[in-house]
Interface confidence: low
């Protein structure tokens, strides 16, 4: 099984650059599209860009264009993500992940924490608005309290249809436990990923989707994210924290 192993934590000054590595063990990167996703504290996951394996073609999210560079060393089975002109808002955990041709991300690296210490400097200016085409994924509720054995339903609404030009709907669900990388649960709306318990199910179409846990178990208390990979830039919901009802 492929494993993605990332480089260690980095502490950087504003204005500096950081280069994070992602090494594939158990296989080479030659056949894989590698994507980079980041997660700032308390924020949703953000897709940054990818590199194609056969020609090293890259595509970046408009938000990071000009600041991010993704490269690959084929012989070392390693992909790299370099982010320049760092500012405090870039403090985040950066993940590399492999694109599967069913449209989801799996597996994920363990994450690399990048801390940009401001040293008392002023905050940077706000980023420019997107090109108007980014799909916003709205999850509800933000927090859900249930008792073990109860049913839990999480909703995810997309700002436009997620039907891809190939006819598929690339809407996926991930579970993230504290200190861990996201883990794929459901891909393409309703397909349970390997070894995911049958109590997890996904449904929906067009713009409205639901993740259901038929009988919640103690290990299910985590944060759940929906994600769409039908349209670039790929986007994630804000997350739903499933907690034990006290």
């Amino acid at each position: 099984q492929v494993q993605l192993v990332q480089s260690g934590a980095e502490l950087k000054k504003p204005g500096a650059s950081v280069k994070v590595s992602c090494k594939a063990s158990g296989n080479t990167l030659t056949n894989y599209v590698i994507h980079w996703v980041r997660q700032a504290p308390g924020q949703r996951l953000e897709w940054m860009g990818y590199i194609l394996p056969y020609n090293d073609l890259t595509k970046y999210s408009q938000k990071f264009q000009g600041r991010v560079t993704i490269t690959r060393d084929k012989s070392a089975s390693t992909a790299y993500m370099e982010l320049s002109s760092l500012r405090s808002e870039d403090t985040a955990v950066y993940y590399c992940t492999r694109w599967d041709w069913d449209g989801f991300f799996d597996p994920w690296g363990q994450g690399t924490t990048v801390t940009v210490s401001s040293g008392g400097g002023g905050s940077g200016g706000g980023g420019s608005g997107g090109g108007g085409s980014e799909i916003v994924m709205t999850q509800s509720p933000a927090t859900l309290s249930v008792s073990p054995g109860e049913r839990a339903s999480i909703s995810c609404r997309a700002s436009q249809s997620l039907v891809h030009s190939n006819g598929n709907t690339h809407l996926h669900w991930y579970q993230q436990r504290p200190g861990q990388a996201p883990r794929l649960l459901i891909y393409s709306v309703s397909n349970r990923f390997s070894e995911v318990p049958a109590r997890f199910s996904g449904s929906g179409s067009g713009t409205d989707f639901t993740l259901t846990i038929s009988s919640v178990e103690s290990e299910d208390f985590a944060v759940y994210y929906c994600s769409q990979t039908s349209h670039i830039p790929y986007t994630f919901g804000g997350g739903t924290k499933l907690e034990i009802k006290s």
């Epitope: 158990g26 080479t28 030659t30 006819g167």
Partner: antibody, heavy 120, light 111 residues
Framework: QVQLQQPGAELVKPGTSVKLSCKAS????????IHWVKQRPGQGLEWIGR????????KYNEKFKSKASLTVDKPSSTANMQLSSLTSEDSAVYYC?????????????WGQGTSVTVSS | DIVLTQSPASLAVSLGQRATISCQAS??????????MHWYQQKPGQPPKLLIY???NLDSGVPARFSGSGSESDFTLTIDPVEEDDAAVYYC?????????FGGGTKLEIK
């Protein structure tokens, strides 16, 4: 030169099974998926499934899920396909083919094919 | 499944002329600017041989008279000029999504 060597022919009885082999040479076996393709006499090509020799992970065409079973033997750089419960419909040429890297989701090198004849 | 419709089913072309084979997919086979459509040549008693990968890339050792074009769901294989050695059956194949599928084939005869 990359080669995928397959036995020329197999004559088998209905209801039995047959195991077809595909020996790879002149490249790193674990770096490329192996796909299998069926071609009935005078017919087109049908994708059966694929195996990742590195992990053993398989994916099948729904149509062949209960018919074909794909395995690999890493030490000998050999991919195998077992076909079970054979009927006359399974009489065909079966190709193994390599996929990955430069050609990226295209089958670049093909074996010569094994002709399977199911007859009593 | 993605259905690939090739036309014509057979084609007779004079030596030195241009041959054009069309392949239409029932849905888009393009992804992030890449078209996962490929062309193969098969001669009697031989396995298919890759000619063109990802719509327009000529495989190594394939003569430049072969070219591929198209995107989304419409693709074309062109042979210009046709040579005697080109008499064969030509297949398009998509690897956008499984099950990976092939066109029905176009038999090219040299007049």
């Amino acid at each position: 030169q990359v080669q995928l060597q397959q036995p020329g022919a197999e004559l088998v009885k209905p209801g039995t099974s047959v195991k077809l082999s595909c020996k790879a040479s002149a490249y790193t076996f674990t770096n490329y998926w192996i796909h299998w393709v069926k071609q009935r006499p005078g017919q087109g090509l049908e994708w059966i499934g694929r195996i990742d020799p590195n992990s053993g992970d398989t994916k099948y065409n729904e149509k062949f899920k209960s018919k074909a079973s794909l395995t690999v033997d890493k030490p000998s750089s050999t991919a195998n396909m077992q076909l079970s419960s054979l009927t006359s419909e399974d009489s065909a040429v079966y190709y193994c083919t390599r996929w990955g890297d430069l050609h990226y989701y295209a089958m670049d090198y093909w074996g010569q094919g094994t002709s399977v004849t199911v007859s009593s | 499944d993605i259905v690939l419709t090739q036309s014509p089913a057979s084609l007779a072309v004079s030596l030195g002329q241009r041959a054009t084979i069309s392949c239409q997919a029932s849905e888009s086979v393009s992804f992030t600017g890449t078209s996962l459509m490929h062309w193969y040549q098969q001669k009697p008693g031989q396995p298919p041989k890759l000619l063109i990968y990802r719509a327009s890339n000529l495989d190594s050792g394939v003569p430049a008279r072969f070219s591929g074009s198209g995107s989304e769901s419409d693709f074309t294989l062109t042979i210009d000029p046709v040579e005697e050695d080109d008499a064969a059956v030509y297949y398009c194949m998509q690897s956008m999504e499984d099950p990976y599928t092939f066109g029905g084939g176009t038999k090219l005869e040299i007049k």
